[in-house]
């Protein structure tokens, strides 16, 4: 946030940039949390825009029995590995075809025993406040589907009739990692020393990191004709004086008519 300065007072302004603001020759360049001519004001909203998508990674092991292990399969650049990867990917795409969050598989290692396939199942979902539940459900469906296929697609008399066959007992889920996104935590961190006063409110399932000085939210502070200003002790209303009234009170809701205070002296002017 920047505020431009014109005229003779600019040199004075340069030395007076506050809150870590820096002078660029024309104006104070303010850090994210501040704005104003001297970076003296605290912003009332902080952009913590969530990622568009949240990812999860499941580390799985399955044992493929319809391919015999050869040493070339250890080499990821070999033709053997590439052909295995192609078939395995196609097979898994069929297995997980009903899961909207499924993105694909990534083979990390092939080892002996027929072919033990260490791989990651990659999941992704659009960010919503319920993303954890969505991904938790998807990981459960992945477990169900891989268990089912490795039970059903098995060798009979050393022959496989499917694209791939598996050892029923060789299926294991090692680990599940979900990308963590915590808007409340991000909001607190980005608000720094004002963190106690900033909160997350949702609008159209999007999180907004706001202080009570941001209008239009349930926590918004109504300063009436005054101005809401954030300080280290919290949001405060700075009340205004008009030609006819002084305003006071915590929310500037108490107006005193100047003519009542000045009385008849006011009329002699």
């Amino acid at each position: 946030r920047t505020t431009t300065c014109f005229g003779d007072g600019c040199q004075n302004t340069a030395s007076r940039c506050k809150n870590g603001g820096t002078w660029d020759g024309l104006k104070c360049q303010c850090p994210n949390l501040y704005y104003g001519e001297l970076c003296e004001e605290v912003v009332s909203s902080i952009d913590i825009g969530p990622p568009e998508t949240i990812s999860a990674q499941m580390e799985l092991t399955v044992t493929v029995t319809s391919v015999k292990f050869t040493e070339e399969l250890k080499n990821h650049s070999s033709q053997e590995f590439q052909e295995f990867k192609q078939t395995f990917t196609e097979q898994m795409n069929i297995v997980y075809s009903g899961i909207p969050e499924y993105v694909g598989v990534n083979i990390t290692k092939l080892r002996l025993g027929s072919v033990v396939v260490e791989h990651d199942v990659l999941l992704r979902t659009k960010y919503t406040p319920e993303y954890k539940t969505v991904l938790d459900n998807a990981t459960e469906v992945v477990k169900e589907k891989i268990t089912k296929v490795t039970t059903q697609q098995i060798m009979i008399n050393d022959i496989c009739s499917d694209m791939m066959c598996f050892n029923t007992t060789g299926t294991q889920v090692q680990n599940i990692t979900v990308t963590q996104y915590d808007p409340e935590e991000d909001c607190r961190k980005m608000a720094k020393e004002y963190g106690d006063y900033f909160v997350v409110e949702y609008r159209d399932q999007k999180p907004y990191c706001i202080s009570p000085c941001e209008p239009g939210f349930s926590v918004s502070k109504n300063c009436n004709l005054g101005k809401c200003q954030m300080s280290l002790s919290g949001p405060q209303c700075l009340c205004v004086t008009t030609e006819t009234h002084w305003y006071s009170g915590e929310t500037c809701n108490q107006g005193t008519q100047k003519s009542l205070v000045y009385g008849h002296h006011h009329h002699h002017h």
Epitope: T70, M163, M164, C165
Partner: nanobody
């Protein structure tokens, strides 16, 4: 990239014989798996005879004792000797290959395919 070219198809009377050949380009012939598949009109492609570099072979029940799969590594060629041919053997015959040592009859597991050669058994 493996290139496969079949030959040897034709029209033969029931009880007759044919020998199909599949010439492969590339240096992968001595490893992996090789096979013959066929597709009859209106049917799915099916495994007829398969062979792997570890010596494993497979024959479909309907051709056991009549068909023989073999390969000549020096010529990079796969063969299918077909004897006692029947009308139900009429089909397009395809050569297939994979550098993997496979144990599957499913065509989707096989990566390299020829264009096919037609075999018609008719009197």
């Amino acid at each position: 990239e493996v290139q496969l070219v079949e030959s040897g198809g034709g029209v033969v009377q029931p009880g007759g014989s044919l020998r199909l050949s599949c010439a492969a380009s590339g240096d992968t012939f001595s490893r992996g798996s090789w096979g013959w598949f066929r597709q009859r009109p209106g049917k799915e492609r099916e495994a007829v005879a398969l062979i792997s570099s570890d010596g494993w072979t497979f024959y479909a029940d309907s051709v056991k004792g009549r068909f023989t799969i073999s390969q000549d590594n020096s010529k990079n060629t796969l063969y299918l000797q077909m004897n006692s041919l029947r009308a139900e053997d009429t089909a397009m015959y395809y050569c297939a290959a994979s550098v993997l040592v496979l144990r599957t009859l499913n065509p989707k597991a096989w990566h390299h395919w020829g264009q096919g050669t037609q075999v018609t058994v008719s009197s």
